[in-house]
Interface confidence: low
């Protein structure tokens, strides 16, 4: 067959769908690879062809669009399953072609089983809610396009295994779930089950997401440097190891890049000749406030090193701060024999 631009297997789009539920899968060509949409392609006389490779097989097969009740169908650039079966798992290819042009891409589709409490191998999106921030909502995701706007689905929300009814601060509002005041106790997996009728059949869409309650922007502050501080002096003799921790607290801020770095005499450690190592550790609170510790280490410090300026810097979306460590050379202990001898000899 003639050459075809093959985009390969697009593993970035590992699509997971639940067994026995409808699934609509758009051909990724138009979304990620080509600079034109399906309508343009169709009006230019290009045809979209679908085929697949079953799990653990190498043979490409055409998709059977003649199953009872049109279980699998194609509509424009969408492949429909009404509903999916477990053995629909495989790699699916959509190919756009005419006599002079051909482009194709494959993507993995995994049909996943869930238990009665909605547990499954499905990768769950995470939705962050601010703690004690007033009313916040999550929306049942990825249900657009499954039914026309005139069809009114019923939506049932669950937290874990339990239907959300008469919860103190969580109220189902159709496609939305409202949290009146989000608390740590609201952390968990939330599932919406959307039930809608179509051609005399009833279909269910199950969507689970993880809610994580995080620090509120109302409480957010610029970074706080706990160490170094004015109370601790790093007093070393030449030849000893110098260890200075920089410990910084960052309030949770959505999409903020938290940074910590050291400067030595105003330069980054990489830009100077001293043998310095920096080790970083990060810990999080329950509301995803972050504590970063960067330990600056000089194995064998020299008297020159002990005269340098060591400054810890921190930056977040809330601001930038810096704090110098108090480093000094330890005064040598008195050599008593010499001093005493001198003392007596002064008579």
């Amino acid at each position: 067959s003639e050459r075809c631009d093959d985009w390969g297997l697009d593993t970035m789009r590992q699509i997971q769908v639940f067994e026995d539920e409808p699934a609509r899968i758009k051909c990724p060509l138009f979304e990620h690879f080509l600079k034109f949409n399906y309508s343009t392609a169709h009006s230019a006389g290009l045809t979209l062809i679908w085929y697949w490779t079953r799990q653990d097989r190498d043979l490409e097969e055409p998709i059977n669009f003649r199953l009872p009740e049109n279980r699998i169908s194609k509509e424009k650039d969408v492949l429909w399953f009404r509903p999916t079966l477990l053995n629909d798992t495989g790699n699916y290819t959509c190919m756009l072609r005419n006599t002079t042009y051909c482009s194709k891409v494959a993507f993995p589709l995994e049909v996943v089983q869930k238990d009665s409490c909605f547990n499954s191998p499905m990768k769950l999106p995470v939705h962050k809610l601010y703690i004690e921030y007033g009313i916040q909502r999550i929306t049942c995701p990825n249900v657009d396009g499954y039914f026309p706007s005139s069809v009114k689905p019923t939506i049932t929300w669950y937290m874990g295994c339990y239907k959300i009814q008469n919860f103190n601060n969580v109220i189902p509002e159709g496609m939305n779930l409202s949290f009146l005041i989000a608390l740590i106790s609201n952390n968990g997996n939330y599932t919406c089950v959307v039930t809608y009728p179509e051609n005399g059949r009833t279909f269910h869409l199950t969507r689970t997401l993880t809610v994580k309650v995080v620090g509120s922007p109302k409480n957010a502050v610029p970074p706080v440097i706990h160490s170094p501080n004015d109370h601790v002096v790093y007093e070393k003799e030449p030849g000893e190891e110098l260890l200075i921790p920089c410990t910084v607290y960052f309030s949770f801020l959505m999409d903020s890049r938290n940074e910590v770095w050291w400067t030595i005499d105003g330069k980054k450690p990489d830009d100077i000749t001293i043998d310095v190592t920096i080790n970083e550790s990060i810990s999080h609170s329950r509301t995803e406030d972050e504590t970063r510790t960067q330990i600056l280490s000089i194995k064998k410090v020299t008297s020159e090193d002990l005269k340098r300026s060591y400054v810890c810097h921190a930056r977040s979306a809330k601001g930038e701060v810096a704090k110098a460590a108090k480093v000094k050379q330890k005064v040598p202990a008195p050599r008593y024999t010499v001093e005493l001898a001198c003392g007596f000899g002064a008579t």
């Epitope: 026309p148 706007s149 005139s150 069809v151 009114k152 689905p153 019923t154 939506i155 049932t156 929300w157 189902p172 509002e173 159709g174 496609m175 939305n176 009728p197 179509e198 051609n199 005399g200 059949r201 009833t202």
Partner: antibody, heavy 120, light 110 residues
């Protein structure tokens, strides 16, 4: 011609019951997503009562005040919509319209209405 | 329940005037809003659905806009046959489907 025609309106005593019908002609119920009832008290505005999905599941929706007293149903073979009204009150006095909804065109087809009077 | 607040409740206008009627939903209803015209003794007639789509056979002087909670019906140049009462209908497509009409706006001759 595509049309809806209500019937069954009458004078009824408070606490009584009544069943309204709405016959569709010129189209099949199954081509309509929803069949609904709307009422209008004399000299007042429109008030939604209930809707039923035309597919086999027959999902029903009610205004909160109508739940428990009013029941919507349909007979696809007769192309007819019903509204069973129980425990009627004076404030239920109104013209009752049936309306159909297709493809997101909310209430694109209406009947002429039937008058229900609740009075002793 | 969802509440649709329509304003004004009545307005007087002349032929050729531009008329604007607003409707506010107590909840986010996306674009699930329709506008109707009703004349005395008649059933309502659908003018606009999905907030801005003109129903079949409706003159182009009628237009709708808005989404979420704020919606507007505009008659660009009022004609004699447009004197009537106008209603908005909001559809709250959530766990239990709720339809609600606005209180109506009566357009009378000035």
């Amino acid at each position: 011609e595509v049309q809806l025609e209500e019937s069954g309106g009458d004078l009824v005593q408070p606490g009584g019951s009544l069943r309204l019908s709405c016959a569709a002609s010129g189209f099949s119920f199954s081509s309509s997503y929803y069949m609904c009832w709307v009422r209008q008290a004399p000299g007042k505005g429109l008030e939604w009562v209930s809707c039923i999905y035309a597919g086999s599941s027959g999902v029903t929706y009610y205004a909160s005040w109508a739940k428990g007293r009013f029941t919507i149903s349909r007979d696809n073979s007769k192309n007819t919509l019903y509204l069973q009204m129980n425990s009627l009150r004076a404030e239920d006095t109104a013209v009752y319209f049936c309306a159909s909804e297709t493809d997101g065109n909310y209430f694109n087809l209406w009947g002429q209405g039937t008058l229900v009077t609740v009075s002793s | 329940d969802i509440v649709m607040t329509q304003s004004p409740s009545s307005l007087s206008a002349s032929v050729g005037d531009r008329v604007t009627i607003t409707c506010q939903a107590s909840e986010d209803i996306y674009s699930n809003l329709a506008w109707f015209q009703q004349k005395p003794g008649q059933a309502p007639k659908l003018l606009i659905y999905r907030a801005s789509t003109l129903a079949s056979g409706v003159p182009s002087r009628f237009s709708g806009s808005g989404s979420g909670t704020e919606f507007t019906l505009t008659i660009s140049s009022l004609q004699p046959e447009d004197f009537a009462t106008y209603y908005c209908l909001g559809v709250y497509t959530y766990s239990t489907d709720i339809h609600a009409f606005g209180g109506g706006t009566k357009v009378v001759i000035k």
